[in-house]
Interface confidence: low
């Protein structure tokens, strides 16, 4: 024979307990029916009689199986920057969440108590770490190589678009302005947005927001056969390649000529012992920076011959949109003797991506004025080991060329040489866009 | 063992506000449970307050006479507070915490705490 | 709110005595009713619920009964230890706005 079924109520075997969405009434002694989420308890149960249960009133709510006298009440309605995720219903109290753009300050059980804007990066800086539905984004400084001109809660720091000319050298704050030639550019030149696809190895940048200090390099004067920069999309055209090979190869032995013509007169050069530094500055020594890293330009000693390059001084701070921040840490201000490099990675997450290397070689063209030759060969290389810490740091390492050098060098040798082993292939060599300024 | 503590009780003057702490040990607010306050005035009776229903952040319940001026909130899984504003003398008591329960009504206000003196005067 | 009224406000009863304490609802609340005793200087301790139900440790000399708006509470067998005040109060879901959890004046007990 089947088991018989117990009809609600009903008592309980001695030691047993009451079946699912039952329970033990004390007073009946008996098992009795819950009321049902969206009910509540109108009359409970008696020896001979089951619960009577009734419908929760409008704005109360029971969630659960539930013998109570009475339904919850929702909460309040949801404030100005909050969104009623889910309704006030019999069966279920009223969620509120935060609104596009805001973010939870203060979380409660369910849903959110208290709102807040999301901070917005302004021009300079980008998204380190975006905001979540109950963290605020944090900002970080654009690091060399890379820019923001938005004001927003998702962009992050893009790189300079590289160019075959730099009209405008970029800043932390502004995109590289090329002359008339198509730009390259390792990804799209719309705002970067939060999340962003992985993009090429050698920018560096990845979903997570910590774009490196990559430098776009404009291909002033073309030393040797360098290959395109690593992940740029575009050939440049023959004739345009052509054009500024000869032009620049013209110059050269020109230059060439005249510091032979100047030796061979027994006037020595007066080669600048012009000094590149090679600090080992660590990412973590520019994080506390108050703005951006300064996009230092390079300048040349003033020529009377005028050449391709910029050589005056004014002409070219005329041009750098001047940044009214402290000078980054590690970026010492450097006299016309000297080029120092340093780079300040604004890390905002420990690790960073490894060791990063930039490699510039700047050529100066020789010119005779006054009986004085004046011809410098610059190497600046600048490391980022996000793995050392700042006192381990050369304060003041000089690595000077010797007068020999002073004509420059078709391949400025390879950064090893300079930098030992490092990571990552450098770039192609070239003036950067963010070099160095004078005092 | 599980236990309610009161805390915060203190001497103020009228029309000053004040708020005392329920902290519970042995065991951390869920769905079952009701934090309410109830007060004892010096030689009388007990008074309910009013409740909250922390696993939710609410809602709260108050007596008639308890709305406007006291306002109970869950501050983390473990406390409560009762906020008490614009003191008269009539509000000296002692402030007791108690655990109610929302889904077995054989288990209302099983556990107090001893309870926090605050007294109103001048 | 509900009014809860409880008589009488101070009994005096002989040590083995027997004491009814009566408790009135201002409306019904069915058998949501518990009775507390409380000693000076302690927070109350619950004594029966649901009208009628002891609570665990709770010596059976103490009994409740009622439903609806009456309610009665009785101490047999008195002892000094039960010199206290008694409160009834109404539970009929502290969720109450109907109900509220009002408790009674309360009743003062002697034991002579």
């Known amino acids: 024979l089947p088991a018989q079924v117990a009809f609600t109520p009903y008592a309980p075997e001695p030691g047993s307990t009451c079946r699912l969405r039952e329970y033990y009434d004390q007073t009946a002694q008996m098992c009795c029916s819950k009321c049902s989420p969206g009910q509540h308890a109108k009359v409970f149960c008696t020896k001979t009689s089951d619960t009577v249960c009734d419908s929760c009133e409008d704005s109360t709510y029971t969630q659960l199986w539930n013998w109570v006298p009475e339904c919850l009440s929702c909460g309040s309605r949801c404030s100005s920057d909050q969104v009623e995720t889910q309704a006030c219903t019999r069966e279920q109290n009223r969620i509120c969440t935060c609104r596009p753009g805001w973010y939870c300050a203060l979380s409660k059980q369910e849903g959110c108590r208290l709102c807040a804007p999301l901070r917005k990066c302004r021009p300079g800086f980008g998204v380190a770490r975006p905001g979540t539905e109950t963290s605020d984004v944090v900002c970080k400084p654009c690091a060399p190589g890379t820019f923001s001109n938005t004001t927003s809660s998702t962009d992050i720091c893009r790189p300079h678009q590289i160019c075959n000319v730099v009209a405008i050298p970029g800043n932390a704050s502004m995109d590289a302005v090329c002359t008339s030639t198509s730009p390259t550019r390792s990804m799209a030149p719309g705002a970067v947005h939060l999340p962003q696809p992985v993009s090429t190895r050698s920018q560096h940048t990845q979903p997570t927001p910590e774009p490196s200090t990559a430098p776009s390099t404009s291909f002033l004067l073309p030393m040797g056969p360098s290959p395109p920069a690593e992940g740029s999309t575009g050939d440049f055209a023959l004739p345009v390649g052509l054009i500024v090979g000869v032009t620049a190869l013209g110059l050269l032995i020109i230059g060439v000529v005249n510091c032979v013509i100047m030796t061979q007169v027994k006037k020595k050069p007066l080669c600048l012992q012009r000094e590149a530094k090679v600090p080992h500055l660590p990412a973590d020594k520019a994080r506390g920076t108050q703005g951006p890293e300064q996009q230092h330009l390079l300048i040349t000693a003033p020529s009377s011959s005028s050449s391709s390059l910029e050589s005056s001084a004014s002409a070219l701070d005329r041009r750098a949109p001047t940044r009214n921040q402290p000078q980054a840490p590690g970026v010492e201000a450097s006299g016309a003797g000297e080029a120092r490099a340093s780079t300040g990675s604004s890390d905002s997450s420990p690790g960073g991506h490894g060791t990063q290397v930039n490699v510039t070689c700047i050529v100066n063209v020789c010119s005779s004025s006054d009986h004085s030759s004046q011809c410098s060969s610059q190497a600046s290389s600048t490391m980022g080991d996000t793995d050392s810490s700042p006192s381990e740091s050369p304060k003041d390492e000089q690595v000077p060329f010797s007068k020999e050098e002073c004509a420059f060098r078709s391949q400025l040798e390879t950064p090893e040489t300079l930098l030992g082993s490092t990571e990552e292939k450098p770039l192609p060599l070239g003036v950067p866009d963010a070099g160095m300024k004078p005092s | 063992q599980q236990q309610l503590e009161e805390s915060g009780g203190d001497l103020v003057k009228p029309g000053a506000s004040l708020t005392v702490t329920c902290t519970a040990s042995?065991?951390?607010?869920?769905?079952?449970?009701?934090m309410c306050w109830v007060r004892q005035a010096p030689g009388k009776g007990l008074e309910w307050i009013g409740c909250i229903y922390p696993s939710i952040v609410g809602p709260t319940y108050y007596a008639n006479w308890a709305k406007g001026r006291f306002t109970i909130s869950k501050t983390s899984s473990t406390t409560v507070t009762l906020e008490m504003t614009s003191l008269t003398a009539a509000d000296t008591a002692t402030y007791f915490c108690?655990?109610?329960?929302?889904?077995?009504?054989?288990?209302?206000?099983?556990?107090w705490g001893p309870g926090t003196l605050v007294t109103v005067s001048s | 709110d509900i009014v809860m009224t409880q008589t009488p406000a101070s009994v005096s009863v002989p040590v083995g005595g027997t004491v009814t304490i009566k408790c009135q609802a201002s409306q019904s609340i069915y058998n949501y009713l518990s009775w507390y005793q409380q000693k000076p200087g302690q927070p109350p301790k619950r004594l029966i619920y649901?009208?009628?139900t002891l609570a665990s440790g709770v010596p059976s000399r103490f009994s409740g009964s009622g439903s609806g708006t009456e309610f009665t509470l009785t101490i047999s067998d008195l002892e000094c230890a039960d010199a206290a005040t008694y409160y009834c109060q109404s539970n009929s879901g502290v969720n109450g706005n109907r109900y509220g959890n009002a408790f009674g004046g309360g009743t003062e007990v002697v034991v002579k």
């Open positions: 108690v655990r109610d329960r929302y889904d077995d009504y054989g288990d209302y206000f099983n556990l």
């Open positions: 042995g065991f951390s607010f869920t769905n079952n449970y009701y």
């Open positions: 649901y009208a009628s």
